[in-house]
Interface confidence: medium
């Protein structure tokens, strides 16, 4: 089940998933001047068996200049921030993802991918928060959020984190 909303926004903080639950999708987005290859995958999908999870499909980008017909509209960075985004370069150190059955590791970068990754999370996904550079964390509880299903609706738990200057 897809999570209907984005993880909560915490002022001066970013979130990151350490591993991705099966069913998670990652958009195949290309940086400006590039597009998905013709009939290329729309997204990668975390799939797996009881013993192993991996990403279906590969994202591939090619120069927009090589195509004369249709043009893919790539979201601008300010548009991307409205959706579930995870910055590629994160100062967080991932946990041992191999120890999480039913989860995929962070997919390796593909050539000419967009600067931000757009994930579509599923129920049960956990994301972790940390303060951006120049801010320090005041913890009142776990600095994490989980997508939960309650009464047929999805919601993210509120992370107990305040970032102060």
């Amino acid at each position: 089940e897809l999570c209907d909303d984005d993880p909560p926004e915490i002022p001066h903080a970013t979130f990151k998933a350490m591993a991705y639950k099966e069913g998670t999708m990652l958009n195949c987005e290309c940086k400006r001047g590039f597009r998905r290859i013709k009939s290329g995958s729309l997204y990668m999908l975390c799939t797996g068996s009881s013993s192993h999870s991996s990403w279906d499909n590969q994202c591939q980008c090619t120069s927009s200049a090589t195509r004369s017909t249709t043009k893919q509209v790539t979201p601008q960075p300010e548009e991307q921030k409205e959706r579930k985004t995870t910055e590629m370069q994160s100062p967080m150190q991932p946990v041992d993802q191999a120890s999480l059955p039913g989860h995929c590791r962070e997919p390796p970068p593909w050539e000419n991918e967009a600067t931000e990754r757009i994930y579509h999370f599923v129920v049960g996904q956990m994301v972790y928060y940390q303060c951006v550079q120049g801010y320090r964390a005041l913890h009142r509880g776990p600095a994490e959020s989980v997508c939960k299903m309650t009464h047929g609706k999805t919601r993210w738990t509120q992370p107990q984190l305040i970032c102060t200057g």
């Epitope: 999570c3 999708m25 729309l42 997204y43 509209v73 979201p75 548009e79 959706r83 579930k84």
Partner: antibody, heavy 119, light 107 residues
Framework: QVQLQESGSGLVKPSQTLSLTCAVS??????????WSWIRQPPGKGLEWIGY???????YYNPSLKSRVTISVDRSKNQFSLKLSSVTAADTAVYYC???????????WGQGTTVTVSS | DIVMTQTPSSLSASVGDRVAITCQAS??????VNWYQQKPGEAPRLLIY???TLQRGVPSRFSGSGSGTGFTLTINSLQPEDFATYFC?????????FGGGTRVDIK
């Protein structure tokens, strides 16, 4: 429970522009993980995907219609719209809007609206 | 474009029958296939997504199988309300494409 409702002109003259709107209720068009699609079905025929839009405004169109199609979103009104220019009789169809969860399929559909192109 | 070839285009069956509809993709699309049911005058209804996962609220007599290029929708013990047209759809890449449809009517 998310519901979709199409509205717009049921009769369009050839060479004019078809305009339809899909109102989203019971949920936000800004919900993550979904795109918002237009699909059409000519009388007695199969389904044809026209295109879809993210709430951010990023669009993907069917190349066969791309030169004539514009899909836009109005987050303040919780709706998205379809414009199809230079219509001909071949554009006569039932037009559906749908919520698409990519791998997860088009799980919510409008009831459809019939558009006839005729002078 | 990925072409989805659906067979048969129509079939006649009786209540209680087991019915199978197949969809062939023109190239490998993993399990990125969805199945829909459409009744006259109504919008399509999602039955199966991801080739084999039953959509919430859909009776368990419907099942989907296959991956790669070959996919099957099976209806076990056909019920009166199942007489309709069925479509497959690939969600692997744009343009999103549908099969031509299979009309299931009463024998």
């Amino acid at each position: 429970q998310v519901q979709l409702q199409e509205s717009g002109s049921g009769l369009v003259k050839p060479s004019q522009t078809l305009s339809l709107t899909c109102a989203v209720s019971g949920g936000s068009i800004s919900s993550g993980g979904y795109s918002w699609s237009w699909i059409r079905q000519p009388p007695g025929k199969g389904l044809e995907w026209i295109g879809y839009i993210y709430h951010s405004g990023s669009t993907y169109y069917n190349p066969s219609l791309k030169s004539r199609v514009t899909i836009s979103v109005d987050r303040s009104k919780n709706q998205f719209s379809l414009k199809l220019s230079s219509v001909t009789a071949a554009d006569t169809a039932v037009y559906y809007c749908a919520r698409a969860g990519y791998y997860y399929g088009m799980d919510v559909w409008g009831q459809g609206t019939t558009v006839t192109v005729s002078s | 474009d990925i072409v989805m070839t659906q067979t048969p285009s129509s079939l006649s069956a009786s209540v209680g029958d087991r019915v199978a509809i197949t969809c062939q993709a023109s190239r490998n699309i993993w399990s990125y296939v969805n199945w829909y049911q459409q009744k006259p005058g109504e919008a399509p209804r999602l039955l199966i997504y991801g080739a084999s996962t039953l959509q919430r609220g859909v009776p368990s007599r419907f099942s989907g199988s296959g991956s790669g290029t070959g996919f099957t929708l099976t209806i076990n013990s056909l019920q009166p309300e199942d007489f309709a047209t069925y479509f497959c759809q690939q969600s692997h890449s744009t343009p999103i494409t549908f099969g031509g449809g299979t009309r299931v009517d009463i024998k």
